[in-house]
């Protein structure tokens, strides 16, 4: 897998261990926690990143548990099971044999059950809504400029094809970025919207996953765009299955 040959590091994932033990002495990088080989020319899957995050020594982890907003990722961090391709397994269980079903971005989509719980398939998250609030500025950003720069960011930094950035909405100070990617649209080699959204989320929090790159410095016509809060909403191709008790809670 491609990695920076000169010093053998993984540009797209700093939570890796790299060594020149690939074919022909090529640099090969493996994700912490899972030991799986990763392709350093593209984003690492969210499942492998979460696993690496959970495997890091507690005292070395400077990362903060995400806020537990309703309708977002209420369960926060957990140590996931990933399949051989680095995707989330449809069923996730903890050490106390409590199990639940997740979608393709690893967010719980059923009530919790026991080991008898069945999750027939990994349901794809095909629509992600990233809701941002930016810090006050002298004036509102120009909507067209903002659209251009956010599209450039997802294209350049996360290598997400522009066709998957469905829309950028703006009503000062709220920015909404809609990512859409159906199973039929995603070709081999395309970055997954869930992975792009996760990298973006970590960048916004100042916890960049990129090796050695500075943090996210986003400007629109030279004006810094500083985000003060983020909410991410996930919509699945098949609606989630929660009991009425949870829905009315």
């Amino acid at each position: 897998h491609t990695a920076a040959q000169d010093n053998c590091t993984c540009p797209t994932n700093k939570m890796t261990v790299c060594s020149p033990d690939g074919p022909g002495g090529r640099c090969q990088c493996r994700a912490l926690g899972s030991g799986m080989a990763v392709d350093c020319s593209t984003l690492t899957s969210k499942c492998l990143l979460l696993k690496a995050r959970m495997s890091a020594p507690k005292n070395a982890r400077t990362l903060v548990r995400p806020s537990e907003h309703a309708l977002v990722d209420n369960d926060g961090l957990y140590d996931p099971d990933c399949d051989p391709e680095g995707r989330f397994k449809a069923r996730q269980c903890n050490q106390t044999s409590v199990c639940w079903c997740v979608n393709s971005v690893g967010v719980r989509r059923t009530d919790k059950g026991d080991l008898s719980l069945r999750c027939d398939e990994l349901v794809r998250t095909h629509h992600i809504l990233i809701d941002l609030r930016h810090r006050p500025t002298a004036g509102a950003f120009n909507h067209s400029d903002l659209d251009a720069e956010l599209r450039r960011l997802f294209r350049e930094r996360y290598r997400l094809h522009p066709k998957f950035v469905a829309a950028v909405h703006y009503e000062q100070p709220t920015i909404q970025i809609e990512l859409r990617q159906n199973t039929s649209q995603k070709a081999a080699g395309d970055v997954d919207i869930g992975d792009a959204a996760y990298y973006f989320e970590r960048d916004i929090k100042g916890e960049s996953l990129f090796q050695g790159r500075g943090g996210l410095d986003l400007r629109v016509r030279g004006e810094p765009l500083q985000v003060e809060r983020t909410l991410i909403y996930y919509l699945d191709e098949i609606p989630p299955k929660f009991s009425m008790k949870r829905l009315t809670a």
């Epitope: 659209d147 251009a148 950028v168 500075g214 410095d217 016509r221 030279g222």
Partner: antibody, heavy 117, light 111 residues
């Protein structure tokens, strides 16, 4: 008023490295925008080479990526192009230009680089 | 890469004429908010000059006889009443996808 000015040798030998510098006045290259190199072979169309951003991020045209490096010197308000292993096909007028929000609003006057032994 | 095709490749016209140049992209270069298609004018021995950005926005200082339209894959540059200084080569450029790509150019000559 933003101004860009290319400088560098007009003649480069085949297999050598082409090196050009763009000096920017009227705007700090680390304050914003994207700072590009574009070329135009004699009598032909325009080809985008790549850019360096205000924060130092690079993006290159995949057709040239293996041979191109764009760097910057913020103390001099300059950005530079290096194109290695040049051939006669790299003979062109090289322009530096500012990319505002994905279009080029300011251009240098261009410098002709001939690759010949 | 997105291919940009301009037509015609060359065009002869007279002062006062209305001229239309078209640019077709191999895939859509529009978003819900933007049309990432821009037009430049280039005179011999000079750098290109931005005329129209995002399909229809006139760059500051550009005469109002120039206008742009279109969306998706098909775009046009119109010069309403040709002036002697308008005889030049015109290029379209897309910035929806990397790498940025230009049309092959349309040379506008005096009839």
């Amino acid at each position: 008023q933003v101004q860009l000015q290319e400088s560098g040798p007009g003649l480069v030998k085949p297999s050598q490295t082409l090196k050009l510098t763009c000096t920017v006045s009227g705007y700090s290259i680390s304050s914003g925008y994207y700072w590009n190199w574009i070329r135009q072979p004699p009598g032909k169309g325009l080809e985008w080479i790549g850019y360096i951003s205000y924060s130092g991020r690079n993006l290159y045209n995949p057709s040239l990526k293996s041979r191109v490096t764009i760097s910057r010197d913020t103390s001099k308000n300059q950005f530079s192009l290096k194109l290695s292993s040049v051939t006669a096909a790299d003979t062109a007028v090289y322009y530096c230009a500012r990319d505002t929000t994905a279009y080029f609003d300011y251009w240098g006057q261009g410098t002709l680089v001939t690759v010949s032994s | 890469d997105i291919q940009m095709t301009q037509s015609p490749s060359s065009l002869s016209a007279s002062v006062g004429d209305r001229v239309t140049i078209t640019c077709r992209a191999s895939e859509s270069v529009s978003s819900s908010v933007n049309r990432f298609l821009h037009w430049y004018q280039q005179k011999p021995g000079k750098a290109p000059k931005l005329l129209i950005y995002r399909a229809s926005n006139l760059e500051s200082g550009v005469p109002s006889r120039f206008s742009g339209s279109g969306s998706g894959t098909d775009f046009t540059l119109t010069i309403r009443s040709l002036q002697p200084e308008d005889f030049a080569t015109y290029y379209c450029q897309q910035s929806n996808e990397d790498p940025y790509t230009f049309g092959q150019g349309t040379k506008l000559e005096i009839k």
